[in-house]
Amino acid sequence: TGADTEAVVCVGTACYTAHSGKLSAAEAQNHCNQNGGNLATVKSKEEAQHVQRVLAQLLRREAALTARMSKFWIGLQREKGKCLDPSLPLKGFSWVGGGEDTPYSNWHKELRNSCISKRCVSLLLDLSQPLLPSRLPKWSEGPCGSPGSPGSNIEGFVCKFSFKGMCRPLALGGPGQVTYTTPFQTTSSSLEAVPFASAANVACGEGDKDETQSHYFLCKEKAPDVFDWGSSGPLCVSPKYGCNFNNGGCHQDCFEGGDGSFLCGCRPGFRLLDDLVTCASRNPCSSSPCRGGATCVLGPHGKNYTCRCPQGYQLDSSQLDCVDVDECQDSPCAQECVNTPGGFRCECWVGYEPGGPGEGACQDVDECALGRSPCAQGCTNTDGSFHCSCEEGYVLAGEDGTQCQDVDECVGPGGPLCDSLCFNTQGSFHCGCLPGWVLAPNGVSCTMGPVSLGPPSGPPDEEDKGEKEGSTVPRAATASPTRGPEGTPKATPTTSRPSLSSDAPITSAPLKMLAPSGSPGVWREPSIHHATAASGPQEPAGGDSSVATQNNDGTDGQK
């Protein structure tokens, strides 16, 4: 069906019309366009209220709309191939008549993420609820429909027509009927404001009598930004009623003559305009000529005015409106400047924080300060950043280079450091010897001991430890036989590190070797065996081919 019933609300410099009819968004836009308008914008809360008023008017006239949740197209659309943009208030949508991306929005729910299809916005009205100014219609986006298939719950659309200005409604001083015909082909007998170029047909009389008079007027621009009908004096005046009918059609005061005639007058501070009906303030600021937060300031003798802007704003070319000053043009900040409505704000780069001498200054964040250091060990603050360092026996690790990982000196790039057994510890290492050999005072070499197959020299006592300065008490140890004394073959067993309780002691178990007594010349490659936390040290399986059994309190692959 086409567009049927319509309602009209005119306010400011625009008129809004609401239409019922199941049309696609394109058909609705075409309907508005034919009369010189577009599907309505809703660029502010105030405009949303105007649109709500015209919809309420339409709904009062409509008998019964088919859906409880009704939708009415407005002029917000996203073209095919334009993606949803969550960073913007209008989410990548734009007003069909053009215009800027305004900050006001009233989305019903999270929008569907799409790019391929054209998407259109409708106002969602819950017809089971009264329309209240505090409960403005929500914006619902969806497919734009097609001829014969408008989309689910589409019941109509709202158009907007913009004008240079408006005339006041004509005032009748006696019985009669005014019919306005607008440029967008709507007829109405009650408009709060009548758009420029509208025609007014006035039929005076009681209606049932033959002596009705007709008058025809046009809303014209009399002077820049001044619109009126070109009529003088009240219309349809009747000596029978005098000032008693609609205050004689006067804007303010009505003065009756003795013969039933009357004149309009104005209160102090106001003057009568050329139409001899309307009163205007003698104060040029009373018509609120200044816009956008500008204040009207009277000139000398109250004759003219100038507009003044609040701090952070300046007058635009019209000298009536305020626009934001971009303070960032003057580079007032040390690092980043963000322009804001009426002002600006300084921001600092990553690694800096506000502070230091002067407005908008930034100072280095000391990432190494007590309690905030991201480093596991050493931390050096730098300008805008930091870097981590590790104690001897550790190297930097982790994806962000803040962690320290133990260097396994027993498998280091320079080769084994011990003559025989090597025990890696957290941040350090120490050496041990095979049975029949003892650790030399240098803590590295092995010398021939008493001829016996006793336990090996395991981890030395505290005083024997060749610990590096700053290293910690060992939490994990790996026994790595490296090279036998005086040219014995190397044996480098591979080991796993089971997870054990942190207080498990490092112990040694008997080491039985198949070698001639007292001869270090030949030995079998030992296999390393770790005791589990639960069972404690135990004899390794495999009998005579074994080495020191140790508890390991580290976590597999971690220290």
Epitope: K80, G81, C83, L84, D85, P86, S87, R112, N113, S114, C115, I116, S117, K118, P143
Partner: antibody, heavy 120, light 108 residues
Framework: QVQLVQSGAEVKKPGASVKVSCKAS????????MHWVRQAPGQGLEWMGG????????AYNQNFKGRVTMTTDTSTSTAYMELRSLTSDDTAVYYC?????????????WGQGTSVTVSS | EIVLTQSPATLSLSPGERATLSCRAS???????LHWYQQKSGASPRLLIY???NLAFGIPARFSGSGSGTDYTLTISSLEAEDVAVYYC?????????FGGGTKVEIK
């Protein structure tokens, strides 16, 4: 979790057509567009086009000169890509992909690929 | 259509080294619409970075992206063996979506 499972490998003769399917799961099928990207052996990635399952609207790469058609079956949550008038240049791996909850055409989910060989 | 040119074609580095991959557009691209993908041998592409500098889910922090206008960069701060792959940039500023020719990253 989102999954895109494609149909198996195809061997076709020059001049024939191929129809590759992509079954989606783990999300509401009509919520996300489905796109198709192909990769010839040893070559880079080439976008073929996409379809909006909610409306059936499509966007195609003009390089395919009307040879490609993309469709969906919302009842089975499956997208289809048909390529006609095949030549040896169409030998490639064909991927279905979509951008899920990400924005600005950042393709977050990919099918495993369907190998299409065109040979006489 | 916008053409994306990636350089170098191949990048050979040692583990731990910094890798810098470039993607140049034939005309300006919105930073929101520039993305990077990683494709390992025999696998489907995987989203690495979206909207110039945002890490996709599950991507290690050693990957980062930057750029604006026509010049964009993908950086791997410390190359690991598992990073061996072909890396593609992709843009959208109206159909068709286009991909760069790819940069192959290999271990020296």
């Amino acid at each position: 979790q989102v999954q895109l499972v494609q149909s198996g490998a195809e061997v076709k003769k020059p001049g024939a057509s191929v129809k590759v399917s992509c079954k989606a799961s783990g999300y509401t099928f009509t919520d996300y567009e489905m796109h198709w990207v192909r990769q010839a052996p040893g070559q880079g990635l080439e976008w073929m086009g996409g379809i909006d399952p909610e409306t059936g609207d499509t966007a195609y790469n003009q390089n395919f000169k009307g040879r490609v058609t993309m469709t969906t079956d919302t009842s089975t949550s499956t997208a289809y890509m048909e390529l006609r008038s095949l030549t040896s240049d169409d030998t490639a791996v064909y991927y279905c992909t979509n951008y899920g909850n990400l924005y600005y055409y950042a393709m977050d989910y990919w099918g495993q690929g369907t190998s299409v060989t065109v040979s006489s | 259509e916008i053409v994306l040119t990636q350089s170098p074609a191949t990048l050979s580095l040692s583990p731990g080294e910094r890798a810098t991959l470039s993607c140049r557009a034939s005309s300006s691209v919105s930073s929101s619409y520039l993305h990077w993908y990683q494709q390992k041998s025999g696998a489907s592409p995987r989203l690495l970075i979206y909207s110039t500098s945002n890490l996709a889910f599950g991507i290690p922090a050693r990957f980062s992206g930057s750029g604006s206008g026509t010049d964009y960069t993908l950086t791997i701060s410390s190359l690991e063996a598992e990073d061996v792959a072909v890396y593609y940039c992709q843009q959208y500023s109206g159909y068709p979506l286009t991909f760069g020719g790819g940069t192959k990253v290999e271990i020296k």
